[in-house]
């Protein structure tokens, strides 16, 4: 230790009165680059948040119902390259959700100008029962919906072949799966290529002749034996899905019409949806034709605008 | 169906060889591993190497042949054998195999089918 | 590295006879095993696949068995033809290494 101690002092010996001005001078300028790091620091968090607010207005989680298809008619195909994939695509349009608070209610017109003549009026005198009602139409403040198409298509020269066993180096493997779906007697056929992918333990394989991928996903398992050892792998088709189109759009109701002010209001939610499709129901009241009315007085309910 | 062996030849040590295996009667498919074996005189079968006749086109070597001795196909019926830095070790007659898989496996495999070989001397 | 071992080197038996050679393998080689015929000037001949099954073609004289790491090929009413070479030979499919593919020694069978 003593002999460290030396060595220390020998050191500050040899340094000049220069240097340590030079040091001061460092320790300054360390100084000002830990507050500008600071500050940066605050900026990138800051920035951080308002990205993660922005990215959560652009995430839509959808329910979409079930669809009944029509099948039209059958396409004869001009070549063999349009036997080798079924494609398909499908529109999908989000339902807008409204949520109408207590107090509130929604008037759809059947008519646009009605509702842009019921909206100008702004304030309107409602007979509820006994009560004289004030109420204010106001355009409905319509949050973002989306619009896109999902195009799918799913190849017949492809299949996906999923659990396959890591009992093998990358390269046997690969000729392990092209040997045994190129077996006929286990209804594989000539096989064009073998994407192999050890991590996942999953392949797409690719065959030469169409027909052999539907042949062999007719069971949902293929037998893959390895040293005598059988592994049955599991067999789906090989689909692509792109999405295409993709829209967002927002705006308000040209036909529907928000209605406040029915706060006080404790009646039933359906006597009183009917009393305001009678007031506007009437031509005198700036109303006209009625399609839907939506009361909310106790809890509040969601209503899904649609194009 | 038959394999023939060609390009052996006498060289001086150092010297490079390039060996063809040419396949009539069958082209190359999935269930064939196409390999080299050579035999020096008077002693037993060594294997050198295989490359898998399917789409992967997988290369197999015996740890002393990496290096210096590599395996092709150069089209679905033939296949060929690089040798460089060759010794007076390496003087054999290098047989072409076709490998067979025999089961609906690929467990089971046999060489069911050899060319007559082709004779390398290396000598100065 | 996969290592065959051929035993005996040399064998001889008077026609009618029975030889038996026997392959060991350094790993286990799952019956994946052939055994093959060779005569002076000659390529070698496929006799037996998967350790036990016989090549079409080959008489049933020729008899292989054996699993694991122990193998065993048997040759019964033996005929003068039946002097030759006979060498084991396996590939393996393995996680650690290449398809390692090994010849054993030979074994040579006199006929008297």
């Known amino acids: 230790m003593e002999a460290d101690k030396d060595d220390t002092q020998q050191i500050l010996k040899e340094h000049s009165p220069d240097e340590f001005i030079k040091d001061e001078q460092n320790k300054g300028l360390i100084d000002e680059i830990t507050k500008k790091n600071i500050q940066l620091k605050k900026e990138i968090q800051k920035l951080e948040t308002e990205l993660q607010e922005a990215t959560k207005e652009f995430q839509i989680k959808e329910d979409i119902p079930e669809t009944k298809m029509k099948f039209l008619s059958v396409e004869t195909p001009e070549n063999d390259s349009q036997l080798s994939n079924i494609s398909c695509s499908f529109q999908v349009s989000s339902k807008v959700p409204y949520e109408i608070q207590k107090g509130q209610a929604l008037i759809t017109f059947e008519k646009e100008e009605v509702a842009q003549n019921v909206v100008s009026m702004s304030k309107h005198h409602v007979q509820i029962k006994d009560v004289n009602l004030e109420v204010t139409a106001k355009p409905v403040p319509l949050n973002s919906g989306v619009r896109f198409q999902v195009y799918v298509e799913v190849s017949k020269m492809k299949i996906n072949v999923t659990e396959i066993p890591d009992t093998l180096r990358e390269d046997q493997m690969r000729d392990k799966l092209e040997l045994s779906f190129s077996k006929s007697r286990n209804g594989g056929g000539e096989v064009d290529r073998v994407d192999y992918d050890r991590q996942s333990g999953s392949a797409v394989i690719t065959f030469v002749e169409i027909g052999v991928a539907d042949k062999i996903l007719k069971k949902k398992e293929y037998p893959l034996y390895i040293n005598q050892t059988c592994h049955r792998v599991t067999v789906s088709p090989y689909t692509e899905i792109h999405l295409k189109k993709y829209q967002i759009f927002s705006g308000t109701s040209k036909r529907t019409v928000l209605l406040t002010g029915m706060e006080g209001i404790q009646m039933d939610e359906e006597i009183v949806e009917d009393l305001i499709n009678i007031h506007f129901q009437r031509a005198k009241n700036g109303g006209g034709e009625v399609d839907v009315v939506k009361c909310s007085l106790g809890q509040p309910h969601i209503a899904y605008f649609e194009e | 169906q038959s394999l023939e062996e060609s390009g052996g030849d006498l060289v001086k040590p150092g010297a490079s060889l390039t060996l063809t295996c040419t396949a009539s009667?069958?082209?190359?498919?999935?269930?064939?591993?196409m390999c080299w074996v050579r035999q020096a005189p008077g002693k037993g079968l060594e294997w050198i190497a295989c490359?898998?006749?399917?789409?992967?086109?997988?290369t197999y070597y015996a740890s002393w042949a990496k290096g210096r001795f590599t395996i092709s196909k150069t089209s679905s019926t033939t296949v060929t054998l690089q040798m460089t830095s060759l010794t007076a070790a390496d003087t054999a007659t290098y047989f072409c195999?076709?490998?067979?898989?025999?089961?609906?496996?690929?467990?089971?495999?046999?060489?069911?089918?050899w060319g007559p070989g082709t004779l390398v001397t290396v000598s100065s | 590295a996969l290592v065959m071992t051929q035993t005996p080197s040399s064998v001889s038996a008077a026609v009618g006879g029975t030889v038996t050679i026997n392959c060991q393998a350094s790993?286990?080689?799952?019956?994946?095993l052939a055994w093959y015929q060779q005569k002076p000037g000659q390529p070698p001949k496929l006799l037996i696949y998967?350790?036990?099954n016989l090549e079409s073609g080959v008489p049933s004289r020729f008899k292989g068995s054996g699993s694991g790491t122990e193998y065993t090929l048997t040759i019964s009413d033996l005929e003068c033809d039946d002097a030759a070479t006979y060498y084991c030979?396996?590939?393996?499919?393995?996680?650690?290494?290449?398809?390692?593919?090994?010849f054993g020694g030979g074994t040579e069978v006199v006929v008297k």
């Open positions: 490359i898998y006749a399917g789409s992967s086109g997988s």
């Open positions: 790993q286990n080689i799952y019956t994946n």
């Open positions: 195999a076709r490998e067979y898989s025999y089961d609906d496996y690929g467990d089971f495999w046999g060489a069911n089918l």
């Open positions: 009667g069958f082209s190359f498919s999935s269930s064939y591993y």
């Open positions: 030979q396996s590939s393996l499919y393995s996680r650690i290494a290449d398809r390692a593919n090994a």
């Open positions: 998967g350790a036990s």
